[in-house]
């Protein structure tokens, strides 16, 4: 077993056989309470300043014959660096100045090993080196500068902030880390609780409007504040926060503003401002119109940035009807503190006089827009309709009319400058353009700068001036073995016109082809027609192609019709009626072309 002579110990170890015994600075009297006393604990004073290495203690194995056959090995916290061992004698020394605040406890392991074999002569033993504290650290505040706020006019003893200083020294030993707080600067306004560091108000009626900022210096001293203790300080910047202890006040009793009668609703006319010594929401002001002839005609809104009241137009003004308005405007704090209501009402009022100024206004059309109609077959100079505009001013200046040529580049329309009659100056075509959107200008003759514009929407009405025609080019075929009355093609027609009652087309063979034709036209009465075979069988060697002239008519007034040609080729087909050959023989019989007669 590893051991040391009892005489070497600072105080006796328990009489218990250990594998490895240690002796040295085990100062057990420092923590003598029996149950927590540890046999394998050393104490070392921190910040040792001696010239030699600080002696820690000695390891000894009872298998050590003193012949150098054993080697003592140290491992764990700081082994070989902070703590070195004489491998022959087992003496342990500390090589550096130790700082308890950096590391208070070192756990090391010791072993005695046979030098020859490397074989441990007993199990590894663990021991502790505790660093003994000295008062070498001053209290340090958690912040160099604290910032805090407290409402103005607070009662004496109101909590402001708690400052905290920590002392790195050992709180479990002596008073090295026992901190006491005191106030060095900031009386008589504030006080500090010596044990907690809580700062409180100490003076009644501290008024922010009088003084807002206070700088308080707090000292923290260890050793319970006794002489010789180390100390640290911190600065606490305290700001008094605002409470609503001041009402709004208008700097003048009357305000006068002017506004043109043309001001649209929402136009700002002027600004009024009541002052309030408070800040933030306590200085917020709500403005309202409480009385006066202008109650319905004007509004007041609050500018949240500047806390000004902005007088705005609520309804359209008319100089010709009323020239002056008087309002009573009130400014009040929306956030009132009941405990300060005894100071009086938190509102004030002022009179606002508004003068309406006359404005020369442009002509006003009788309508916001005009919708007119005209037939597409109207002759040039046909009147479509008229527009009317008047000068709204008392002067009732005469008006002249014109067409804005940017909206009628082709000069299709004209206007009588005196009476506002609109007439055509070119022929119209509904199928080219259905709606014409133009702008008419009304200008005061005596003041050409005053003009107004109005849109005219002119609809062109349909006239039946287009004949129906085939919807597509028709080229069809008929099988040589076709039976009579077999449908070989359906015809469809289109018409550019847009009759009121819709299209109704009729289909027929042209008179010159009707008699003795090899095909017939069947009008389906639904704007389609079918081409049917008229005989059994066709011979493509006799006639390879038939041309059928078809007349298509509408039923509008005046009736319009056109003739379209359908090409029918005679083809050889299989028994399913699928076309096999149409064109090869046509080259042999170049004369095989007929109109179908």
């Amino acid at each position: 077993t590893l051991s040391t002579p009892l005489s070497k110990r600072t105080s006796g170890f328990p009489a218990k056989k250990r594998a490895l015994e240690l002796s040295g600075n085990s100062k057990n009297e420092l923590s003598r309470s029996k149950r927590s006393w540890m046999w394998n604990q050393f104490f070392l004073l921190e910040e040792y300043t001696g010239s030699d290495y600080q002696y820690v203690g000695k390891l000894h194995s009872d298998q050590d014959r003193g012949d150098g056959s054993l080697k003592y090995i140290l491992s764990g916290d700081g082994a070989g660096d902070l703590f070195i061992i004489n491998e022959n004698t087992g003496d342990i020394q500390a090589t550096k100045r130790l700082d308890r605040e950096e590391k208070p406890v070192y756990i090391l392991r010791a072993q005695a090993i046979n030098r020859r074999t490397g074989r441990p002569v007993e199990p590894e033993s663990e021991f502790i080196i505790k660093i003994h504290d000295i008062n070498d650290n001053e209290p340090i505040f958690t912040k160099e500068v604290y910032t805090a706020t407290v409402p103005e006019m607070s009662d004496v003893g109101t909590f402001v902030v708690q400052v905290t200083a920590t002392d790195a020294d050992d709180p479990t030993y002596g008073n090295s880390a026992k901190v006491v707080y005191s106030i060095l600067q900031g009386q008589p306004y504030f006080s500090v609780e010596s044990e907690t560091g809580i700062i409180k108000t100490a003076l009644l009626n501290m008024d922010r409007e009088n003084r807002e900022q206070y700088q308080v210096v707090i000292q923290a001293k260890d050793m319970g504040g006794q002489m010789g203790g180390l100390s640290g300080t911190t600065t606490v910047n305290i700001t008094l926060t605002d409470v609503n202890d001041n009402p709004p006040r208008f700097p003048q009793s009357t305000y006068q503003f002017k506004t043109p009668e043309s001001s649209p609703p929402g136009t700002p006319i002027g600004r009024i401002k009541a002052s309030d010594a408070d800040v933030g929401e306590n200085a917020e002001i709500e403005y309202s119109i409480t009385d006066g002839e202008g109650l319905d005609m004007f509004d007041v809104i609050t500018d949240q940035e500047t806390q000004e009241g902005i007088i705005t137009v609520k309804k359209l003004l008319d100089f010709e009807k009323k020239k002056v308005y008087t309002l009573k405007v009130e400014a009040s704090n929306p956030h009132v503190e009941p405990r300060f209501l005894y100071l009086g009402p938190f509102k004030d009022s002022a009179t606002v006089r508004i003068v309406v100024e006359d404005v020369d206004e442009p002509p006003v059309f009788s309508k916001l827009a005009y919708i007119l109609q005209i037939r597409e077959d109207a002759q040039i100079n046909t009147t479509i309709g008229s527009v009317t505009a008047q000068d709204p001013d008392a002067a009732r200046n005469p008006v002249k009319y014109s067409v804005d040529r940017h909206t009628d580049m082709d000069r299709i329309f004209n206007i009588d400058s005196g009476n506002g009659s609109i007439f055509t100056s070119k022929l119209l075509d509904r199928e080219t353009l259905l709606w014409h959107n133009i702008t008419v200008i009304a200008t005061e003759i005596n003041n050409p700068k005053q003009s107004s514009r109005v849109p005219l929407y002119i609809k062109v009405l349909d006239v039946n001036d287009n004949a129906p025609e085939f919807a597509e080019f028709y080229e069809t075929f008929v099988c040589e073995k076709a039976k009579a009355d077999q449908l070989i093609q359906t015809l469809r027609a289109v018409d550019k016109d847009d009759p009121y009652s819709g299209h109704q087309f009729s289909f027929s063979l042209a008179p010159e082809a009707a008699s003795g034709s090899n095909f017939t036209i069947q009008d389906n009465k639904d704007n389609t027609a079918g081409i049917l075979t008229r005989k059994n069988g066709y011979n493509r060697h006799e006639m390879s192609t038939y041309l059928l002239p078809v007349v298509i008519s509408d039923n509008d007034y005046p009736v319009q019709s056109s003739t379209g040609t359908v090409t029918v080729r005679v083809c050889a087909c299989d028994h399913h009626g699928n076309m096999q050959s149409c064109h090869a023989e046509a080259l042999i019989h170049p004369t095989g072309l007929s109109t179908g007669a």
């Epitope: 074999t117 490397g118 074989r119 590894e124």
Partner: antibody, heavy 117, light 111 residues
């Protein structure tokens, strides 16, 4: 730096003796045990024994108790191994090696012993 | 005597791969948490060189690709990644009890 110097080769007659040397330098000779190891191509490495230079305490493998004798000369920091009654079975490479906690951390280059008539 | 059995007797490993050698003792060579097994490398015509001591400790100046592990009777030696210069014979050795003994050796060849 630590060095263990051994003669490169020895040629001896059967039945005679030989004393192999190992000169140590670069460390405190008396602080470390000196070991001797035999190596034959077929048999691999074979530990012969060791000696503590400070007290001349020795340990031998049973097989070499009557064959090898380990000695030291502290003044010249030299370890010796005498092999007696040599036969062809003793022909091998013999290494000296410094021992530290059961391991051989430095080795000599080895002496090749040839026993031949 | 404690007999050390090394396996395999020889092995061939590709460059960059792992080489693993086993050493089994006829009885435990561990005491109080210390494992008295050591590993050596021997190249042709040279003395052995200590690589690993006390089962897992790397000797000063030895590359970290060499490693060892194990306790009681079973020990393992690894090289990863294997390099060209690692071609050699590797021995285990115990110092737990006299006489100290060596394993029969493992010859490593690089493919």
């Amino acid at each position: 730096q630590v060095q263990l110097q051994q003669p490169g080769a020895e040629l001896v007659r059967p039945g005679s003796s030989v004393k192999l040397s190992c000169k140590a330098s670069g460390y405190t000779f008396t602080n470390y045990w000196m070991h001797w190891v035999k190596q034959r191509p077929i048999e691999g490495l074979e530990w012969i024994g060791d000696i503590d230079p400070s007290h001349s305490e020795t340990h031998y493998t049973q097989k070499f108790k009557d064959k090898a004798t380990l000695t030291v000369d502290k003044s010249s920091s030299t370890a010796y191994m005498q092999l007696s009654s040599l036969t062809s079975e003793d022909s091998a490479v013999y290494y000296c090696a410094r021992g530290d906690l059961g391991r051989f951390d430095y080795w000599g280059q080895g002496t090749t012993l040839t026993v031949s008539s | 005597d404690i007999v050390l059995t090394q396996s395999p007797a020889s092995l061939a490993v590709s460059l960059g791969q792992r080489a693993t050698i086993s050493c089994r003792a006829s009885e435990s060579v561990s005491i109080h948490g210390t494992h008295l097994m050591h590993w050596y490398q021997q190249k042709s015509g040279q003395p052995p060189k200590l690589l690993i001591y006390a089962a897992s400790n790397l000797e000063s100046g030895v590359p970290a690709r060499f490693s060892g592990s194990g306790s009681e009777t079973d020990f393992t030696f690894n090289i990863h990644p294997v390099e060209e210069e690692d071609a050699a014979t590797y021995f285990c050795q115990q110092s737990f009890e006299d006489p100290w003994t060596f394993g029969g050796g493992t010859k490593l060849e690089i493919k």
